[in-house]
Amino acid sequence: KSSNLEGRTKSVIRQTGSSAEITCDLAEGSTGYIHWYLHQEGKAPQRLLYYDSYTSSVVLESGISPGKYDTYGSTRKNLRMILRNLIENDSGVYYCATWDG
Protein backbone atom coordinates (compact mmCIF):
# COMPACT_ATOMS: atom_id res chain seq x y z
CA LYS A 1 0.00 0.00 0.00
CA SER A 2 1.04 3.57 -0.49
CA SER A 3 2.46 5.52 2.44
CA ASN A 4 1.94 9.19 3.06
CA LEU A 5 5.06 11.28 2.87
CA GLU A 6 4.98 14.54 4.72
CA GLY A 7 5.40 16.78 1.72
CA ARG A 8 5.11 20.51 1.44
CA THR A 9 4.36 21.40 -2.16
CA LYS A 10 6.92 23.97 -3.17
CA SER A 11 7.53 25.93 -6.31
CA VAL A 12 11.11 26.17 -7.47
CA ILE A 13 12.30 28.37 -10.32
CA ARG A 14 15.81 27.97 -11.63
CA GLN A 15 17.83 29.19 -14.58
CA THR A 16 18.86 26.89 -17.38
CA GLY A 17 22.18 25.25 -16.57
CA SER A 18 21.77 25.55 -12.81
CA SER A 19 20.85 22.89 -10.23
CA ALA A 20 17.82 22.43 -8.02
CA GLU A 21 17.34 20.49 -4.81
CA ILE A 22 14.06 18.84 -3.85
CA THR A 23 13.41 17.55 -0.34
CA CYS A 24 11.19 14.63 0.61
CA ASP A 25 10.18 14.44 4.26
CA LEU A 26 9.67 10.80 5.19
CA ALA A 27 6.88 9.66 7.50
CA GLU A 28 7.78 7.52 10.52
CA GLY A 29 8.41 3.89 9.62
CA SER A 30 8.88 4.58 5.91
CA THR A 31 10.41 1.74 3.96
CA GLY A 32 14.01 1.86 2.79
CA TYR A 33 13.00 2.21 -0.86
CA ILE A 34 11.95 5.68 -1.97
CA HIS A 35 10.82 6.35 -5.51
CA TRP A 36 10.99 9.62 -7.44
CA TYR A 37 8.46 10.49 -10.11
CA LEU A 38 8.13 13.35 -12.57
CA HIS A 39 4.73 14.52 -13.78
CA GLN A 40 4.74 16.86 -16.76
CA GLU A 41 1.69 18.51 -18.24
CA GLY A 42 -0.11 16.31 -20.73
CA LYS A 43 1.95 13.23 -19.87
CA ALA A 44 1.54 10.29 -17.54
CA PRO A 45 3.77 10.42 -14.44
CA GLN A 46 7.05 8.62 -15.04
CA ARG A 47 9.29 7.03 -12.46
CA LEU A 48 12.80 8.40 -12.70
CA LEU A 49 14.60 6.23 -10.17
CA TYR A 50 14.42 4.77 -6.73
CA TYR A 51 16.76 5.07 -3.78
CA ASP A 52 17.73 2.04 -1.70
CA SER A 53 18.62 3.45 1.70
CA TYR A 54 19.94 0.09 2.88
CA THR A 55 22.79 0.10 0.35
CA SER A 56 22.89 3.86 -0.43
CA SER A 57 22.37 3.00 -4.08
CA VAL A 58 20.23 4.51 -6.79
CA VAL A 59 18.55 2.44 -9.51
CA LEU A 60 17.70 4.38 -12.65
CA GLU A 61 14.58 3.70 -14.63
CA SER A 62 15.31 2.60 -18.19
CA GLY A 63 16.04 5.65 -20.36
CA ILE A 64 17.00 7.92 -17.47
CA SER A 65 20.39 9.57 -17.76
CA PRO A 66 23.04 8.81 -15.16
CA GLY A 67 24.50 11.97 -13.66
CA LYS A 68 21.31 13.95 -14.14
CA TYR A 69 19.87 13.16 -10.72
CA ASP A 70 21.57 12.58 -7.40
CA THR A 71 19.50 11.43 -4.47
CA TYR A 72 20.58 10.59 -0.95
CA GLY A 73 19.28 10.50 2.59
CA SER A 74 20.50 13.42 4.62
CA THR A 75 18.76 12.17 7.79
CA ARG A 76 16.50 9.23 8.65
CA LYS A 77 13.46 11.42 8.04
CA ASN A 78 14.68 13.33 5.05
CA LEU A 79 15.64 12.49 1.47
CA ARG A 80 17.02 14.94 -1.04
CA MET A 81 17.25 14.84 -4.79
CA ILE A 82 19.50 17.15 -6.77
CA LEU A 83 18.67 17.90 -10.41
CA ARG A 84 21.76 18.97 -12.33
CA ASN A 85 22.30 21.01 -15.48
CA LEU A 86 18.66 22.03 -15.76
CA ILE A 87 16.98 22.50 -19.11
CA GLU A 88 13.41 23.53 -19.93
CA ASN A 89 12.43 19.88 -20.43
CA ASP A 90 13.06 19.29 -16.72
CA SER A 91 10.05 21.43 -15.78
CA GLY A 92 7.28 19.59 -14.01
CA VAL A 93 6.07 18.34 -10.65
CA TYR A 94 8.42 15.96 -8.81
CA TYR A 95 7.00 13.48 -6.32
CA CYS A 96 8.55 11.06 -3.90
CA ALA A 97 6.70 7.91 -2.89
CA THR A 98 7.21 4.73 -0.91
CA TRP A 99 5.33 1.48 -0.36
CA ASP A 100 4.92 -0.81 2.62
CA GLY A 101 5.37 -4.49 1.83
Epitope: S57, G63, I64
Partner: antibody, heavy 122, light 108 residues
Amino acid sequence: EVQLVQSEAEVKKPGASVKVSCKASGYTFTRHYMHWVRQAPGQGLEWMGLINPSGSSTVYAQKFQGRVTLTRDTSTSTDYMELSSLRSEDTAVYYCARDNSHLDQVWWFDPWGQGTLVTVSS
Amino acid sequence: QSALTQPASVSGSPGQSITISCTGTSSDVGGYNYVSWYQQHPGKAPKLMIYDVSNRPSGVSNRFSGSKSGNTASLTISGLQAEDEADYYCSSYGSGSVFGTGTKLTVL
Protein backbone atom coordinates in the same frame (compact mmCIF):
# COMPACT_ATOMS: atom_id res chain seq x y z
CA GLU B 1 50.49 8.71 -16.37
CA VAL B 2 46.86 8.00 -15.50
CA GLN B 3 46.20 4.29 -15.81
CA LEU B 4 43.45 1.77 -15.08
CA VAL B 5 44.56 -1.87 -14.97
CA GLN B 6 41.89 -4.56 -14.83
CA SER B 7 41.95 -8.17 -13.69
CA GLU B 8 42.42 -11.12 -16.02
CA ALA B 9 39.78 -12.90 -18.11
CA GLU B 10 37.33 -15.19 -16.31
CA VAL B 11 35.24 -18.19 -17.33
CA LYS B 12 32.14 -18.78 -15.24
CA LYS B 13 29.19 -21.16 -15.19
CA PRO B 14 25.60 -19.91 -15.44
CA GLY B 15 24.28 -18.90 -12.04
CA ALA B 16 27.73 -18.07 -10.67
CA SER B 17 29.13 -14.63 -9.78
CA VAL B 18 32.17 -12.77 -11.07
CA LYS B 19 34.16 -9.97 -9.48
CA VAL B 20 36.30 -7.78 -11.75
CA SER B 21 38.88 -5.39 -10.32
CA CYS B 22 40.18 -2.10 -11.69
CA LYS B 23 43.33 -0.65 -10.14
CA ALA B 24 43.89 3.06 -10.67
CA SER B 25 47.18 4.95 -10.62
CA GLY B 26 48.56 8.35 -11.61
CA TYR B 27 45.80 10.52 -10.13
CA THR B 28 43.93 11.24 -6.91
CA PHE B 29 41.58 8.29 -6.75
CA THR B 30 39.09 9.93 -4.38
CA ARG B 31 38.43 12.84 -6.73
CA HIS B 32 36.77 11.00 -9.58
CA TYR B 33 33.70 8.91 -10.27
CA MET B 34 34.25 5.53 -11.91
CA HIS B 35 31.91 4.04 -14.47
CA TRP B 36 31.53 0.46 -15.63
CA VAL B 37 30.63 -0.30 -19.22
CA ARG B 38 30.29 -3.63 -20.97
CA GLN B 39 30.48 -4.75 -24.58
CA ALA B 40 29.06 -8.06 -25.76
CA PRO B 41 30.81 -9.69 -28.73
CA GLY B 42 30.15 -7.66 -31.88
CA GLN B 43 27.87 -5.25 -30.00
CA GLY B 44 28.01 -1.65 -28.83
CA LEU B 45 28.88 -0.11 -25.48
CA GLU B 46 26.41 -0.56 -22.62
CA TRP B 47 26.59 1.56 -19.46
CA MET B 48 26.15 -0.44 -16.25
CA GLY B 49 26.69 1.88 -13.33
CA LEU B 50 28.92 4.31 -11.47
CA ILE B 51 30.42 4.75 -8.03
CA ASN B 52 31.11 8.11 -6.42
CA PRO B 53 34.61 9.27 -5.41
CA SER B 54 34.35 8.23 -1.75
CA GLY B 55 32.62 4.96 -2.56
CA SER B 56 29.65 5.94 -0.41
CA SER B 57 27.02 5.77 -3.15
CA THR B 58 26.34 4.01 -6.41
CA VAL B 59 24.03 4.40 -9.38
CA TYR B 60 22.95 1.40 -11.46
CA ALA B 61 21.19 0.94 -14.77
CA GLN B 62 17.81 -0.67 -14.22
CA LYS B 63 18.77 -3.60 -16.43
CA PHE B 64 21.37 -4.72 -13.86
CA GLN B 65 19.40 -3.84 -10.73
CA GLY B 66 19.84 -6.46 -8.05
CA ARG B 67 22.66 -8.26 -9.89
CA VAL B 68 25.49 -5.75 -9.96
CA THR B 69 27.42 -4.32 -7.02
CA LEU B 70 30.09 -1.65 -7.36
CA THR B 71 32.55 -1.09 -4.52
CA ARG B 72 35.84 0.68 -4.05
CA ASP B 73 38.82 0.27 -1.76
CA THR B 74 40.34 3.71 -1.37
CA SER B 75 43.35 2.31 0.49
CA THR B 76 44.49 0.44 -2.63
CA SER B 77 42.87 2.71 -5.26
CA THR B 78 40.92 -0.24 -6.61
CA ASP B 79 37.35 -0.48 -7.85
CA TYR B 80 35.37 -3.69 -8.08
CA MET B 81 32.38 -4.76 -10.15
CA GLU B 82 30.56 -7.88 -9.04
CA LEU B 83 27.87 -9.39 -11.25
CA SER B 84 25.79 -12.26 -9.88
CA SER B 85 23.36 -14.82 -11.32
CA LEU B 86 25.37 -14.93 -14.52
CA ARG B 87 23.75 -16.05 -17.76
CA SER B 88 25.14 -16.63 -21.24
CA GLU B 89 24.06 -13.12 -22.33
CA ASP B 90 26.49 -11.68 -19.78
CA THR B 91 29.40 -12.89 -21.87
CA ALA B 92 31.15 -9.61 -22.66
CA VAL B 93 34.21 -7.46 -22.15
CA TYR B 94 33.77 -5.37 -19.01
CA TYR B 95 35.50 -1.97 -18.82
CA CYS B 96 36.06 0.50 -16.02
CA ALA B 97 36.32 4.11 -17.17
CA ARG B 98 37.14 7.20 -15.16
CA ASP B 99 34.80 10.17 -15.30
CA ASN B 100 37.21 12.93 -16.14
CA SER B 101 35.42 15.72 -14.34
CA HIS B 102 35.64 16.46 -10.64
CA LEU B 103 32.75 15.59 -8.33
CA ASP B 104 30.00 16.93 -10.60
CA GLN B 105 30.09 14.42 -13.44
CA VAL B 106 30.32 16.06 -16.83
CA TRP B 107 30.19 13.01 -18.97
CA TRP B 108 33.42 12.08 -20.59
CA PHE B 109 35.36 8.93 -19.93
CA ASP B 110 39.15 8.93 -19.92
CA PRO B 111 41.07 6.73 -19.52
CA TRP B 112 39.53 3.28 -19.87
CA GLY B 113 40.81 0.03 -18.43
CA GLN B 114 42.05 -2.53 -20.93
CA GLY B 115 38.91 -4.59 -20.42
CA THR B 116 38.19 -7.95 -18.82
CA LEU B 117 36.57 -10.70 -20.85
CA VAL B 118 33.98 -12.63 -18.86
CA THR B 119 32.75 -15.80 -20.57
CA VAL B 120 29.65 -17.50 -19.20
CA SER B 121 29.38 -21.06 -20.40
CA SER B 122 28.19 -24.40 -19.05
CA GLN C 1 14.21 8.60 -24.15
CA SER C 2 15.56 7.01 -27.29
CA ALA C 3 19.12 5.98 -27.98
CA LEU C 4 21.67 8.22 -29.62
CA THR C 5 21.50 7.24 -33.28
CA GLN C 6 24.58 6.88 -35.48
CA PRO C 7 24.94 5.51 -39.01
CA ALA C 8 25.97 1.86 -38.87
CA SER C 9 28.86 2.42 -41.27
CA VAL C 10 30.71 5.09 -43.22
CA SER C 11 33.63 4.80 -45.58
CA GLY C 12 36.16 6.99 -47.33
CA SER C 13 39.41 6.87 -49.23
CA PRO C 14 42.77 7.94 -47.79
CA GLY C 15 43.09 11.72 -47.79
CA GLN C 16 39.34 12.32 -47.90
CA SER C 17 37.16 13.76 -45.13
CA ILE C 18 34.25 11.91 -43.56
CA THR C 19 31.59 12.95 -41.04
CA ILE C 20 29.81 10.72 -38.52
CA SER C 21 26.54 11.99 -37.08
CA CYS C 22 25.01 11.37 -33.68
CA THR C 23 21.34 12.28 -33.42
CA GLY C 24 19.61 12.64 -30.07
CA THR C 25 16.90 14.87 -28.66
CA SER C 26 16.54 18.23 -26.97
CA SER C 27 16.93 16.38 -23.65
CA ASP C 28 20.43 15.15 -24.43
CA VAL C 29 22.51 16.29 -27.43
CA GLY C 30 20.44 19.42 -28.00
CA GLY C 31 20.20 20.34 -24.35
CA TYR C 32 23.87 20.32 -23.34
CA ASN C 33 27.33 20.95 -24.71
CA TYR C 34 28.50 17.67 -23.20
CA VAL C 35 29.02 15.40 -26.19
CA SER C 36 32.09 13.18 -26.39
CA TRP C 37 33.43 10.82 -29.04
CA TYR C 38 35.38 7.57 -28.67
CA GLN C 39 37.47 5.54 -31.09
CA GLN C 40 37.70 1.78 -30.66
CA HIS C 41 40.01 -0.47 -32.64
CA PRO C 42 39.20 -4.22 -32.71
CA GLY C 43 40.15 -5.91 -29.46
CA LYS C 44 41.09 -2.62 -27.79
CA ALA C 45 39.48 -0.34 -25.23
CA PRO C 46 37.70 2.83 -26.38
CA LYS C 47 39.81 5.99 -26.53
CA LEU C 48 38.51 9.53 -25.95
CA MET C 49 38.84 11.62 -29.11
CA ILE C 50 36.58 14.65 -28.48
CA TYR C 51 34.93 16.02 -25.35
CA ASP C 52 32.50 18.86 -24.66
CA VAL C 53 31.37 18.81 -28.31
CA SER C 54 34.56 20.14 -29.91
CA ASN C 55 37.54 19.89 -27.55
CA ARG C 56 40.43 17.59 -28.38
CA PRO C 57 42.47 15.92 -25.60
CA SER C 58 46.21 16.35 -25.86
CA GLY C 59 47.73 13.69 -28.08
CA VAL C 60 44.73 13.44 -30.40
CA SER C 61 45.42 14.49 -33.98
CA ASN C 62 43.94 17.79 -35.15
CA ARG C 63 42.46 15.85 -38.07
CA PHE C 64 39.65 15.01 -35.65
CA SER C 65 37.06 17.71 -34.95
CA GLY C 66 33.62 17.85 -33.39
CA SER C 67 30.60 20.10 -33.78
CA LYS C 68 26.92 20.28 -32.95
CA SER C 69 23.81 21.69 -34.56
CA GLY C 70 20.47 21.34 -32.83
CA ASN C 71 19.96 17.76 -31.71
CA THR C 72 22.75 16.35 -33.87
CA ALA C 73 26.45 16.17 -33.04
CA SER C 74 29.09 15.37 -35.65
CA LEU C 75 32.61 13.99 -35.71
CA THR C 76 34.67 14.94 -38.76
CA ILE C 77 37.91 13.21 -39.70
CA SER C 78 39.93 14.98 -42.37
CA GLY C 79 42.88 13.61 -44.31
CA LEU C 80 41.67 10.07 -43.69
CA GLN C 81 44.40 7.54 -42.87
CA ALA C 82 44.41 3.75 -42.74
CA GLU C 83 44.81 3.76 -38.93
CA ASP C 84 41.53 5.70 -38.59
CA GLU C 85 39.64 2.52 -39.50
CA ALA C 86 37.79 1.67 -36.29
CA ASP C 87 34.43 1.86 -34.54
CA TYR C 88 33.33 5.29 -33.27
CA TYR C 89 30.86 5.98 -30.49
CA CYS C 90 29.29 9.23 -29.36
CA SER C 91 28.12 9.90 -25.82
CA SER C 92 25.93 12.65 -24.47
CA TYR C 93 25.01 13.84 -21.02
CA GLY C 94 21.26 13.57 -20.60
CA SER C 95 21.01 10.38 -22.64
CA GLY C 96 19.54 7.34 -20.98
CA SER C 97 21.53 5.07 -23.26
CA VAL C 98 24.76 7.03 -22.51
CA PHE C 99 26.40 5.83 -25.73
CA GLY C 100 25.42 6.01 -29.36
CA THR C 101 24.74 2.95 -31.47
CA GLY C 102 28.25 3.01 -32.96
CA THR C 103 29.63 3.57 -36.46
CA LYS C 104 32.13 1.36 -38.30
CA LEU C 105 34.54 3.46 -40.34
CA THR C 106 36.15 1.71 -43.30
CA VAL C 107 39.12 3.29 -45.08
CA LEU C 108 38.96 2.08 -48.67
